[in-house]
């Protein structure tokens, strides 16, 4: 069995954690597909999508968000307002069986800790962080959009995407990772 | 079979206002972001504003910040763009996409929206 | 917002031809690259996605390859229904944009 190595990331409370993974379409594009947290040895399924998976359709648990396009064998995951508790490894995996399941890219660990969400979450040997500013327009706007969203990328090995409550960030590894959201 | 039909564009003069719609069919419209993409006449593409499924996020490109708003009713399956304190350099068919992830994959046919005094 | 670069901005070529065209971004995208193929007055046609992958309902001889910063469209053999404007798109960074478009036109 291959050993995954597990890509470290950093955050602040309040952030959103977007992880954008593909999979082989051919192979997967009708199976239900999980985000997990490894708990100990064994992993605890905190959210999956339906089968058979309708295109996109976001599936909510809490503050967890699935949404599958398996035309083109795309899966992306949102778990906003992270908080310290969420700490851990977590994996984007194809669901098989509770007991077995096929891991599409190498496990996360998420640190999050106490600080102001507005400053950049860090990954290790980032590169270059760039700031956007959500719209503002003359409608009522939630969380969303009241303070910059935060990209950081990370060497050729891996991406980040760090931002402010409720809006995204991208994980990327080399062969998994859908887009990293970046404005200047 | 996925379609996505514009209107609203016109003619108007500079400072002015307009509201596009995008009436969408064969697809379950709530389930995807959808974006407007515009091309100036004769030149290239560029994405102008983009909204998630229930609306709660909206994106635009800068120089149309502040001016433009994106909007969606699911229950009527329509995105809207109303774009407000029109320039010239805002002319150019608009097309209403649907994001599939990595790519818009469908498209209107496009409305033109003219700004001139 | 990550530039993308296309060339050549146009090229004739014949019934037959093989074409070939090129995009490069201004920073490493991966493999989130798409190809569109434009015909006056139509709206964009998805061609590839994901720098390779052909979006169904293709002819095969479209195909795409690339990652990184270097992609590339090519037209196997060229078909009349083939002259067009064609424009690579990225979806690595948001904003998503396009490469200024490549004319194949008729020589």
């Known amino acids: 069995t291959t050993e995954l190595t597990e890509e470290k990331y950093e955050y602040k409370e309040g952030q959103t954690l977007e992880v954008k993974c593909d999979y082989a379409l051919e192979k997967y594009a009708n199976s239900r597909k999980a985000w997990q947290k490894m708990e100990g040895k064994m992993p605890k399924i905190l959210a999956k999508t339906e089968r058979p998976s309708e295109n996109s359709h976001p599936v909510q648990v809490g503050r967890i968000t699935l949404e599958d396009y398996p035309d083109h064998g795309l899966l992306q995951v949102r778990m906003t307002n992270l908080q310290v508790e969420d700490s851990g490894l977590y994996q984007c995996v194809i669901y098989q069986h509770p007991k077995e399941s096929h891991v599409l890219f190498n496990p996360i660990c998420l640190v999050v800790t106490k600080g102001s969400s507005g400053t950049p979450g860090s990954s290790e040997n980032s590169t270059q962080n760039v700031y956007r500013t959500p719209s503002t327009t003359a409608k009522a706007l939630g969380p969303r959009y009241t303070s910059p969203r935060t990209v950081t990328q990370a060497p050729p090995e891996s991406t980040v995407v760090v931002s402010t409550p409720g809006s995204e960030i991208n994980l990327t590894n080399v062969t998994d990772i859908i887009r990293v959201p970046v404005f200047n | 079979e996925v379609q996505l039909v514009e209107s609203g564009g016109g003619l108007v003069q500079p400072g002015g206002s307009l509201r596009l719609s995008c009436a969408a069919s064969?697809?379950?419209?709530?389930?995807?972001?959808m974006s407007w993409v515009r091309q100036a006449p004769g030149k290239g593409l560029e994405w102008v504003a983009n909204?998630?499924?229930?609306?709660?996020?909206?994106y635009y490109v800068d120089s149309v910040k502040g001016r433009f708003t994106i909007s969606r009713d699911n229950a009527k399956n329509s995105l809207f763009l109303q774009m407000n304190s029109l320039r010239a350099e805002d002319t150019a068919v608009y097309y209403c996409?649907?994001?599939?992830?990595?790519?818009?994959?469908?498209w209107g046919q496009g409305t033109l929206v003219t700004v001139s005094s | 917002d990550i530039q993308m670069t296309q060339s050549p901005s146009s090229v004739s070529a014949s019934v037959g031809d093989r074409v070939t065209i090129t995009c490069r971004a201004s920073q490493g995208i991966r493999k989130w690259l798409a190809w569109y193929q434009q015909k006056p007055g139509r709206a964009p046609k998805l061609l590839i996605y994901a720098a390779s992958r052909l979006q169904s309902g293709v002819p095969s001889r479209f195909s795409g390859s690339g990652s990184g910063t270097d992609f590339t469209l090519t037209i196997s053999s060229l078909r009349p229904e083939d002259f067009a404007t064609y424009y690579c798109l990225q979806a690595h960074g948001f904003p998503w944009t396009f490469g200024q478009g490549t004319k194949v036109e008729i020589k």
């Open positions: 996409a649907r994001d599939y992830g990595d790519s818009f994959d469908y």
């Open positions: 064969g697809f379950t419209f709530s389930s995807y972001w």
């Open positions: 909204i998630k499924q229930d609306g709660s996020e909206e």
